[in-house]
């Protein structure tokens, strides 16, 4: 209709980075930009994804290097994290959120793909990391090894080997394990503090240089108390599980202090593993009963999990695996290991800004049934798995509904703001839910719509439209881009209109009748009034049309609804040669060239395209007859 197809601005980028996967218009104090997601962009050796800022009229795009943003205190893995897969603009302050739903971090032997987002302020500066699903690793442990270095320990090299071997089993790194070592005899010394080394390699290197300090007395109680009161303080982390490993070869010379020392360790929640080395007793034929009782007293209960004894120093190597396994069985404490909560949640797969924060779709949450999380300045709201049971019953829990594949919100005059989320794999046909979130981690689900066709991916794209601009949502559009019809993946967009409190189905939008795959409804954008009739409009992308070149459809709003026949279909081939997947993303909220008309930004594979609006001239014809 009135979108100019002759002089588009085609902004080139990397196809391999999928520059153009997401696009957003951006305004900084009157300067207009496009923010373009390139989720496969490379940073150094890692395919982190990134976001570009592109000037609207001319000039080159600049990478924001958000892929370099690092989270401290986690062992993160940023490769393939898909930064830019979702973008959400906050029109209030012109900040935006760029998400990396496949961002993961190392936890023990696992990588947890919790996802994370970067908040970027209006002048393109990174301001904050948003990662509501990020939880502390179960391997978030401060481990202090308390080594008896008194004269009777022999040969020391065996103790060293044991130390090195056990350290090699530890997942040492930010957000995981820290290790400190103290050695005692008559006195106690720090060999190294908890925060001295940040990798297994460095800790092992330091441990290999620990020499036996000797001493005629074995002050085990003092060694334990020193570890509790000093070693866990120097470099210890708030909230880290405290683990102490005591290795000794004889009764302590301060055993009457053990009761108080152990009580204090219990109060500090220090889990104690104790290893009795019987070499001295066996070499001299002494009954070790009193010694063994003492070591069992030192070890946390139950003894069978925390107490070890070895025949001599050389036999220490035999307990390395068992000790390591026992320590890491702490990982699974009170957890059902067959099920995932937020560990694989992929938070930020979709994002949507609301008044008090941001909604983030987490398709991998709760065993890939999905969830929607909310981050606000006051904290985060993570609904419990049970909150969704009304619409996502237990019997379908292994189906992987992917709730949160897309998120948005609607406003009704009765209920105010209500959140909307799509679950395109629910029961194979897809589902959309409308809900409100509560701070007690529960949800109220007000309405649910179900897809018709298996595999249609109903709910993978959702857009709410306020046609008349009165602040109340008029229409909810739900895409099912894989809808199969006439032997092809044609796609379908369902129209729901708000009647009192419910959205009522009111047909589908019409696409063109080609005989190729189209995926009509892969992207749906509510855009501001394009044709200057004072009604807001809608643009739908069909990125597989015309042999994957892509096309977009413009639908006009009219009197609280939407006209179901497109007013304009724009194909990629009209605009430039070589465009592919044109229409995979769409945004149209700003006048980019200051002609008073709203312009469109459309993403394609390796390109972002700006389409300029043309003015609409309305001619009112009137006839006058003379003589009348």
């Amino acid at each position: 209709f009135n979108m100019d197809t002759r002089k588009p601005r085609v902004i080139p980028g990397s196809r391999t980075a999928f520059f153009g996967y997401t696009v957003q218009q951006h305004d900084i104090s009157g300067n207009k930009w496009l923010v373009v997601g390139a989720p496969l962009e490379t940073n150094g050796y890692q395919k982190t994804g990134d976001v570009y800022k592109c000037p609207v009229i001319h000039g080159n795009c600049t990478k924001l290097n958000l892929g370099r943003v690092t989270l401290s205190n986690v062992s993160e893995r940023k490769d393939n994290m898909r930064l830019g897969l979702s973008l959400a603009t906050n029109p209030k302050d012109n900040s935006f959120l760029a998400c990396s739903p496949l961002w993961s971090h190392e936890c023990g032997s696992s990588y947890y793909t919790t996802g994370m987002c970067s908040r970027v302020n209006s002048n393109f500066r990174f301001s904050k990391t948003v990662a509501p699903a990020l939880q502390r690793c179960q391997t978030y442990m401060d481990i202090v090894i308390v080594l008896d270095g008194s004269n009777s320990i022999y040969p020391w090299v065996e103790v060293q080997h044991f130390l090195i071997n056990i350290l090699k089993k530890f997942y040492i790194g930010p957000g995981q394990i820290q290790v400190g070592v103290v050695q005692y005899g008559e006195d106690v010394v720090h060999e190294f503090h908890l925060n001295d080394y940040r990798s297994v390699k460095d800790v092992v290197e330091a441990a290999s240089h620990i020499e036996q300090r000797g001493g005629t007395e074995t002050r085990t109680a003092f060694g334990i108390e020193f570890a509790r009161s000093e070693a866990f303080q120097k470099g210890g982390r708030k909230g880290a599980k405290k683990v102490m490993i005591v290795i000794t070869d004889g009764e302590s010379h301060d055993s009457p202090d053990l009761e108080k020392v152990i009580q204090q360790s219990e109060r500090d929640n220090v889990t104690r593993y104790a290893v009795a080395v019987l070499g001295y007793y066996n070499r001299r034929g002494i009954n070790p009963e009193t010694f063994l009782n003492e070591i069992k007293y030192i070890a946390s209960d139950p003894d069978d999990k925390h107490f070890f004894n070895v025949t001599d120093e050389a036999a220490l190597k035999d307990i390395v695996d068992a000790l390591g396994d026992r320590i890491f069985s702490l990982e699974g404490t009170n957890k059902n290991e067959t099920s995932f909560g937020l560990e694989m949640s992929q938070t930020g797969f979709s994002s949507h800004v609301v008044e008090d924060g941001v909604l983030l779709g987490a398709v991998g949450a709760y065993d890939w049934n999905g969830a929607v999380l909310k981050e606000t300045s006051a904290g985060k709201v993570i609904p419990l798995r049970e909150s969704y049971l009304k619409e996502f019953p237990e019997e379908l829990k292994n189906h992987g509904a992917y709730l949160g594949y897309t998120v948005t919100s609607v406003v009704s005059s009765r209920q105010g703001r209500v959140y909307v989320a799509g679950a395109p794999r629910f029961n194979h046909t897809g589902k959309v839910i409308l809900f409100t979130m509560h701070n007690n981690r529960s949800l109220t689900i007000h309405q649910a719509m179900r897809g018709q066709q298996i595999g249609s991916y109903f709910g993978s794209e959702i857009t709410s439209v306020d046609i008349d601009g009165d602040g109340v949502t008029d229409v909810l559009l739900v895409g099912a881009p894989m809808y199969f019809n006439e032997g092809r993946e044609r796609g379908k967009v369902y129209v729901y209109e708000l009647r009192q409190n419910l959205f009522v189905y009111n047909g589908t939008l019409k696409d063109s009748h080609s005989y190729q795959n189209a995926r009509f409804g892969s992207s749906i954008a509510s855009v501001r009034d394009l044709n200057q009739d004072s009604y807001n409009d809608v643009v739908v992308g069909a990125p597989l049309e015309d042999n994957h070149a892509g096309a977009i459809y413009i639908f006009h709003g009219f009197r609280g609804s939407i006209l179901k026949t497109p007013k304009q279909r724009i194909t990629a081939s009209e605009l430039a040669t070589g465009l592919q997947y044109f229409g995979c993303s769409i945004h149209g909220q700003l006048d980019l060239n200051e002609d008073g008309l709203i312009d469109l930004a459309v993403g394609a594979l390796g390109n972002a395209v700006i389409l300029w609006s043309r003015p609409v001239v309305q001619i009112n014809a009137s006839l006058h007859f003379e003589p009348s």
Epitope: P256, D257, T290
Partner: antibody, heavy 120, light 109 residues
């Protein structure tokens, strides 16, 4: 030669205070525990308090808890028993004794005792 | 708290007699039980430690044994210098709380 010598005993009025000293020689106070044990006239031995000179951990009998304080000054190789709010029933001979690993946690050396009389 | 019940509270015996004094612990305890001898006006002296180990310088006629929660001091052949009061003492494991028995006075018959 190991020796323990108590001093500081005497006559005190009920409610009064007294500080007993136990000077150790022939061994390092740091490597042992000191216990105070008392014996009322014609009665048996009653354990009073103990201290680890190294860690400063203390233990007290219920009968003296909150009134008596045991301490040690390793630089002087001396242990102390500060007795406050004294009562008539605290009248006894007070002994200090060494307790350590090498005697398998028995009181192997005792002082000669010092008499504390609480009377108005 | 563990109580140590010593019996008898007194006994009369003659030189050359075999004398047995028993201490019963109110609950299961470690072997950290010691026996002391005290003569009037003197400080107690250690005889036996760890229930059955003879302290250095103590005559071999003194011996100690354990059976469950019962601890026994035996003087195999009573000598004139052995007339005194005997105390058992138990050390609470891993603390320096100690408990004495009430004492047994061994008198000349």
């Amino acid at each position: 030669e190991v020796q323990l010598v108590e001093s500081g005993g005497g006559l005190v009025q009920p409610g009064g205070s007294l500080r007993l000293s136990c000077a150790a020689s022939g061994f390092n106070l740091q490597s042992s525990y000191i216990h105070w044990v008392r014996q009322a006239p014609g009665k048996g031995l009653e354990w009073v308090a103990s201290i680890s000179s190294y860690s400063s951990y203390t233990y007290y009998a219920d009968s003296v808890k909150g009134r008596f304080t045991i301490s040690a000054d390793t630089s002087k190789n001396t242990a102390y028993l500060q007795m406050n709010s004294l009562r008539a029933e605290d009248t006894a001979v007070y002994y200090c004794a060494r307790y350590w690993y090498y005697s398998a946690w028995a009181l192997d050396y005792w002082g000669q005792g010092t008499l504390v009389t609480v009377s108005s | 708290d563990i109580q140590m019940t010593q019996s008898p509270s007194s006994l009369s015996a003659s030189v050359g007699d075999r004398v047995t004094i028993t201490c019963r612990a109110s609950q299961s305890v470690s072997s950290a039980v010691a026996w002391y001898q005290q003569k009037p006006g003197k400080a107690p002296k250690l005889l036996i430690y760890s229930a059955s180990s003879l302290y250095s310088g103590v005559p071999s006629r003194f011996s100690g044994s354990r059976s469950g929660t019962d601890f026994t001091l035996t003087i195999s052949s009573l000598q004139p210098e052995d007339f005194a009061t005997y105390y058992c003492q138990q050390s609470a494991p891993y603390s320096s709380l100690i408990t004495f028995g009430q004492g047994t006075k061994v008198e000349i018959k």
